[in-house]
């Protein structure tokens, strides 16, 4: 059974991750200029079902293509470079989902933009954090 | 300007495995954001998106061919490859290599090959 | 698997001839659809991205519009070079699928 420090870990790494999103997302919602079109082309695939924390694997799956699309805005919204960026969410993630069972992601058939990936898990982050207080 | 060209036999017997090679020249296939597909086109048909591969390695298939699709890449060469396992007749088409940016339009093609399924 | 259905699937006309082929979606794929032409021994290639985003070189006699379900290519003037294979793609839902396509002769 987790222990209440084991949850605590897992509870602040759900909210770093959350912020990081957060940040990324409102990066691309500041940013104007033509590139957002193309940003917005690139399609992103969803998880068919995100409730535990074995379903990071899908996020993990998508955040080399995420690195990309953020490499195109070359922006200053972000305070840290997207690979940087990346690098820090990829480590939460490992963490969170754990690496003792293989989880092989099942996708949605429908795919989704930057801002709706980013959205879906926002979601998932602030729904692991209610179940966990 | 990227080219893809195909390479492979062009006849290949049933129940065994067709396989083909897509190589790229004029850019890198490590390029981010960029998906190396496989279409194929059976004779007077339609086209038929059989899968991707990213060049970390990451795969997409055609749900309808997942089960015998196996597609990889070999950065070092410039290079990814098709494997299509127990084929048969209907497998007869033109296979063409195609890039894409973020899974969306599938801008450079190559010239396609044609694989014939025959004993 | 999303259907995607042309019309029509042949058509004949001639030089100067306003042409529009029509696709359809069998779900809403918002505005991920794209338009090829394939001439005979030829690979495809893409003309419209996004239904209505030109991809660069492409004639601007050529353009394309309509989101959901319903798109239109649309040829405002035929050239003789234009006579060819048109498809139209989705790309909104795995796996990515093609309509069965146009044929474009002359008249």
């Known amino acids: 059974a987790p222990t209440s420090s084991s949850t605590k870990k897992t509870q602040l790494q759900l909210e770093h991750l959350l912020l990081d999103l957060q940040m990324i997302l409102n990066g691309i919602n500041n940013y104007k200029n033509p590139k957002l079109t193309r940003m917005l082309t690139f399609k992103f695939y969803m998880p068919k079902k995100a409730t535990e924390l074995k379903h990071l694997q899908c996020l993990e799956e998508e955040l080399k293509p995420l690195e990309e699309v953020l490499n195109l805005a070359q922006s200053k919204n972000f305070h840290l470079r997207p690979r940087d960026l990346i690098s820090n969410i990829n480590v939460i993630v490992l963490e969170l989902k754990g690496s003792e069972t293989t989880f092989m992601c099942e996708y949605a058939d429908e795919t989704a933009t930057i801002v709706e990936f980013l959205n879906r898990w926002i979601t998932f982050c602030q729904s692991i954090i209610s179940t966990l207080t | 300007q990227v080219q893809l060209q195909e390479s492979g036999p062009g006849l290949v017997k049933p129940s065994q495995t067709l396989s083909l090679t897509c190589t790229v020249s004029?850019?890198?296939?490590?390029?981010?954001?960029?998906?190396w597909n496989w279409i194929r086109q059976h004779p007077g048909k339609g086209l038929e998106w059989i899968g991707y591969?990213?060049?970390?390695?990451?795969?997409h298939y055609n749900p309808s061919l997942k089960s015998r699709v196996t597609i990889s890449v070999d950065t070092s060469k410039n290079q990814f490859s098709l494997k299509l396992s127990s084929v048969i007749a209907a497998d007869t088409a033109v296979y063409y290599c195609?890039?894409?940016?973020?899974?969306?339009?599938?801008?450079?093609w190559g010239q396609g090959t044609m694989v014939t399924v025959s004993s | 698997d999303i259907q995607m259905t042309q019309s029509p699937s042949s058509l004949s006309a001639s030089v100067g001839d306003r042409v529009t082929i029509t696709c359809r979606a069998s779900?809403?794929?918002?505005?991920?659809l794209n338009w090829y032409q394939q001439k005979p021994g030829k690979a495809p290639k893409v003309l419209i991205y996004?239904?209505?985003s030109f991809q660069s070189g492409v004639p601007s006699r050529f353009s394309g519009s309509g989101s959901g379900t319903d798109f239109t290519l649309t040829i405002s003037s035929l050239q003789p070079e234009d006579f060819a294979t048109y498809y139209c793609?989705?790309?909104?839902?795995?796996?990515?699928?093609f309509g069965q396509g146009t044929k474009v002769e002359i008249k």
């Open positions: 195609a890039r894409d940016w973020g899974r969306d339009a599938f801008d450079i």
């Open positions: 004029g850019g890198s296939i490590s390029s981010g954001g960029y998906y």
């Open positions: 591969i990213y060049y970390s390695g990451n795969t």
């Open positions: 779900q809403t794929i918002s505005s991920y």
């Open positions: 996004a239904a209505s």
């Open positions: 793609q989705q790309s909104h839902y795995i796996p990515r699928t």
